[in-house]
Amino acid sequence: KFSKQSWGLENEALIVRCPRQGKPSYTVDWYYSQTNKSIPTQERNRVFASGQLLKFLPAAVADSGIYTCIVRSPTFNRTGYANVTIYKKQSDCNVPDYLMYSTVSGSEKNSKIYCPTIDLYNWTAPLEWFKNCQALQGSRYRAHKSFLVIDNVMTEDAGDYTCKFIHNENGANYSVTATRSFTVKDEQGFSLFPVIGAPAQNEIKEVEIGKNANLTCSACFGKGTQFLAAVLWQLNGTKITDFGEPRIQQEEGQNQSFSNGLACLDMVLRIADVKEEDLLLQYDCLALNLHGLRRHTVRLSRKNPSKECF
């Protein structure tokens, strides 16, 4: 199911992107799932749809719920779901876990903290940054574009960082805040030629025709924060987005997991309603960083349906 969690605070702007991708020329219709009521596109409404985006200007606790988006093209429709939760503003300084975005790790060399979801908004610099509710002051902190840079990172810099910015919509300003944890890794990181943990090279994956199938491309790149690392799927040597088969989509799994201190990435290939022609394709799991690229190829084979016992 193409579903995405989104959250925000009451009286702040919240903008949600449809979890299904489509070309800018495709139309996107939004509905409130519980009532199947269409979300208006007129900007005079407090909640309105704008193409791939659903805008709450500002958000209210009552807006919480599941919203459906349908990406319509001349040849297909794709449905996605946005699970939106709007919380009451906290009176104290503590930011609860459910309002936290993904934790980022930094080191002496790399100490960028990106402001989560900011690319969805129409904002102008500078960003305001707070750590544990205190406004950041001093020359060690530099707000640069959509991220915060901390010079000479120390273990004491670990904590919860909140970015605050103003979203402008037709001349009206709305406040937005987003918080994420920052951890400091003191050990020296290193980078290796990519190692693909899954799938195995030339793996044959059994699938059932008409059912859904998932393939996971998982690779590790070294220890600590990696400067440039990526995993992706290709079909017959073509990018998924260029292949033009809406049933087949790739979706990022865990962003950067540090199991055993290793920096690893996952990319899941989701094949809906497996067809015979899918068995003829080569599925390439590619892992790359500055050192180079490694490829593991998977093919699909038909699984014989298990015989029911009566």
């Epitope: 030629f193 090279q201 290709q234 040597g237 073509t238 990018k239 080569q282 390439d284 590619l286 790359l288 050192h291 180079g292 690229l293 490694r294 490829r295 593991h296 190829t297």
Partner: nanobody
């Protein structure tokens, strides 16, 4: 390979490599060089399906590897050339399970073209 020649330091050259006789799609194409009395070294590589590029640190920012899939051709644009870039440049191709500026990933090699940079 083609496009080699003599050039003054700071000048530019563009090398071409037309591939045939193997599956160009999903391959790794690379450029290597060997100066007299020195080991062969990797310069740049490109994964033909998607155009991901990899460079040796000594040329990063000065050399650019690119491709024309319609012509099964790979190029090496060399700018800000230095006398130490003087060498015979070889084009190479590999199956694509690995792609980097490492000679062991390549099993097809061109004849080489000479590049001379004078100060």
């Amino acid at each position: 390979e083609s496009g080699g020649g003599s050039v003054q330091a700071g000048g530019s050259l563009r090398l071409s490599c037309a591939a045939s006789g193997f599956t160009y799609r999903r391959a790794c194409m690379g450029w290597f060089r060997q100066a007299p009395g020195k080991e062969r070294e990797g310069v740049a590589a490109i994964y033909t399906s998607g155009g991901m590029t990899f460079y040796d640190a000594s040329v990063r920012g000065r050399f650019t590897i690119s491709q024309d899939n319609a012509k099964n051709t790979v190029y090496l644009q060399m700018n800000s050339l230095k006398p130490e870039d003087t060498a015979t440049y070889y084009c190479a191709a590999g199956g694509g399970d690995y792609c980097a500026t490492n000679a062991r990933f390549f099993n097809y090699w061109g004849q080489g073209t000479q590049v001379t940079v004078s100060s």
